[in-house]
Amino acid sequence: LKGQEFAPSHQQVYAPLRADGDKPRAHLTVVRQTPTQHFKNQFPALHWEHELGLAFTKNRMNYTNKFLLIPESGDYFIYSQVTFRGMTSECSEIRQAGRPNKPDSITVVITKVTDSYPEPTQLLMGTKSVCEVGSNWFQPIYLGAMFSLQEGDKLMVNVSDISLVDYTKEDKTFFGAFLL
Amino acid sequence: LKGQEFAPSHQQVYAPLRADGDKPRAHLTVVRQTPTQHFKNQFPALHWEHELGLAFTKNRMNYTNKFLLIPESGDYFIYSQVTFRGMTSECSEIRQAGRPNKPDSITVVITKVTDSYPEPTQLLMGTKSVCEVGSNWFQPIYLGAMFSLQEGDKLMVNVSDISLVDYTKEDKTFFGAFLL
Amino acid sequence: LKGQEFAPSHQQVYAPLRADGDKPRAHLTVVRQTPTQHFKNQFPALHWEHELGLAFTKNRMNYTNKFLLIPESGDYFIYSQVTFRGMTSECSEIRQAGRPNKPDSITVVITKVTDSYPEPTQLLMGTKSVCEVGSNWFQPIYLGAMFSLQEGDKLMVNVSDISLVDYTKEDKTFFGAFLL
């Protein structure tokens, strides 16, 4: 039949299609953190560079006030790395004194705030005990996964101790998301 | 007006579109490293398997001489894992002797080289102090993020000490990139 | 020549195209594991939540009996994080007694099973020595990379010791895949 040559197979869908370059995307990089007030049982949120160096936001993905703002509903891949550094944790000192001890820890949480839910939703958590024996220690925690997000959702990165975050280089601590 | 029935909404873009299977992609896997000369303050680059086993390059993404070559401009997700292994680090030995010590460390850097820019750009860094107390240690560093790259850019993976890289299995140490 | 006006440039391909929202995708989250029999030299596989909370499967990507089932051939990004936690490893106790020791370890493997191939294929491995000095320890292993999969392939996550997996929170231990 006329015009059938291009009839799509069951695997091909022609609409609505979109140019990949038009999808919301962001890669944010670390900046020096200013201490901010946070609730007692809530980890503080990091703020980010969104336009200098390697950082960018595009296609209606905006950054404001610690948050990545999701401009359209869909499935997003979200990732972050936070590099921590510190002096010897108390843990090893106490251990040397012969007392067992709950180790210190470092934690990163990627959190979603949505207007359809009264509490933040923890999407991803990386948590690690730190019981280092050297005089200085440093290490990254990396997270990444895919989530279904709604237009208007807000994403942030929370950490257990903002003073331990290595803010010295944009390639060490970062946060990003892109619509799949 | 005639032909207006299919006017796209502001969220739908019809051109230029591309088949996803046509996008540049690569997954490279570890091979045994041959010691190579590198500049004193520059980490050595790893070389990779690009076609055997799990490794592949496709759609004009090519691998040559330690570099992934970017065939077209766009936003890419880039990732790498390097598994390190070694004997007890000096750190713990010195610590046992009662002297404080800067810890040993392991570092992975994904680096971009652009012809039009004199200096390589560090896109991603994972760095970790190693102060292990067992006789042998091993651990991975994983990195991944999205970057805007230009046609002709070259990507490589640098490590702090090539002799500590675990090259025994293709699933332990790898490097990849794909156009979003 | 007639009809040539719309010939795509070498960068633009118009068919077969597909709506991104139609691609197979899954994000699975941890559940409490029931001890299962496994072969002596084979790591046990985790089972997962596939529809509650943050977990989902869509577009013919199905989960059944520890496996993600790949519904169509193509390049997939596959990822997993497993958070482990345990008491002080024997390693440090033995070390204190003055005997050198092969450290304990934690390992995650993302494995592909193909009907046409007798042996499972290890796609990704994260393995880490554990020689902790605190009384309790916890830490994540993250993996993620791109692989060419065939319709009918099955993916699973294996771990070295199922009893050390932190199953308490859906954001700590997870497994996902999506068609690129």
Epitope: F67, L69, V113, D115, S116, Y117, P118, P120, G152, K154 | - | -
Partner: antibody
């Protein structure tokens, strides 16, 4: 301590614009979403719209969309509601509501009567 | 719009009784909310996400359900529970409330 306080004229003439302000304290407005909900006499609750104070992005009830505007002034910790072309049917108690990111919190409500 | 149909519109029960209110959404929703409103007061959130108890809310209040059918229960009615109870969905635009259930003591 979390507080949301609605303020504005209690009486508005028909066809005019109703304006209310919600002043918040005890939390960072940018970490949440701020809504306006109204309750007409003897009736149930009606959601009017919301603003994301971080971005200024708004969503409105389609039944009111042509008449309602919600804005924010983060420097003053305030969210404002404007409802144009009011009629007697807009007589209601208007509530400012916080949601998302923190437990729900409601203002005590502000009664606005539309009458000539 | 997602219509919320709440039943009954009113009920009378004795102190200590188990009270159940249902809410049906015209299409599936992920999260359901239940509010208590006493005369002259602002509504107070009791249940979020269908079954989670809001902070400071007594454990005699509970919620359950998924998709289109949701239930709110007071396991043992107390005098201070006299109020009107509303269900609400926060997902579709507009957000919509049920018409309310007035609970009285016999």
């Amino acid at each position: 301590q979390v507080q949301l306080q609605e303020s504005g004229p209690g009486l508005v003439r028909p066809s005019q614009t109703l304006s209310l302000t919600c002043t918040v304290s005890g939390f960072d407005m940018g970490d949440t979403y701020m809504h306006w909900v109204r309750q007409r006499p003897g009736r149930g609750l009606e959601w009017m719209g919301r603003i994301d104070p971080a971005s200024g992005h708004t969503k409105y009830n389609p039944s009111l969309k042509s008449r309602v505007t919600i804005t924010r002034d983060t420097s003053k910790n305030q969210v404002s509601l404007r409802l144009s072309s009011v009629t007697a049917a807009d007589t209601a108690v208007y509530y400012c509501v916080r949601s998302g990111g923190m437990p729900d919190a409601w203002g005590q409500g502000s009664l606005v009567t539309v009458s000539s | 719009d997602i219509q919320m149909t709440q039943s009954p519109s009113s009920l009378s029960a004795s102190v200590g009784d188990r009270v159940t209110i249902t809410c049906r959404a015209s299409q599936g929703v992920m999260y359901m909310y239940w509010y208590q409103q006493k005369p002259g007061k602002a509504p107070k959130l009791l249940i979020y996400g269908a079954s989670n108890l809001a902070s400071g809310v007594p454990s005699r209040f509970s919620g359950s359900g998924s998709g289109t059918d949701f239930t709110f229960t007071i396991s043992s009615l107390q005098p201070e529970d006299i109020a009107t109870y509303y269900c609400q969905q926060w997902e579709g635009n507009p957000r919509t409330f049920g018409q309310g259930t007035k609970v009285e003591i016999k």
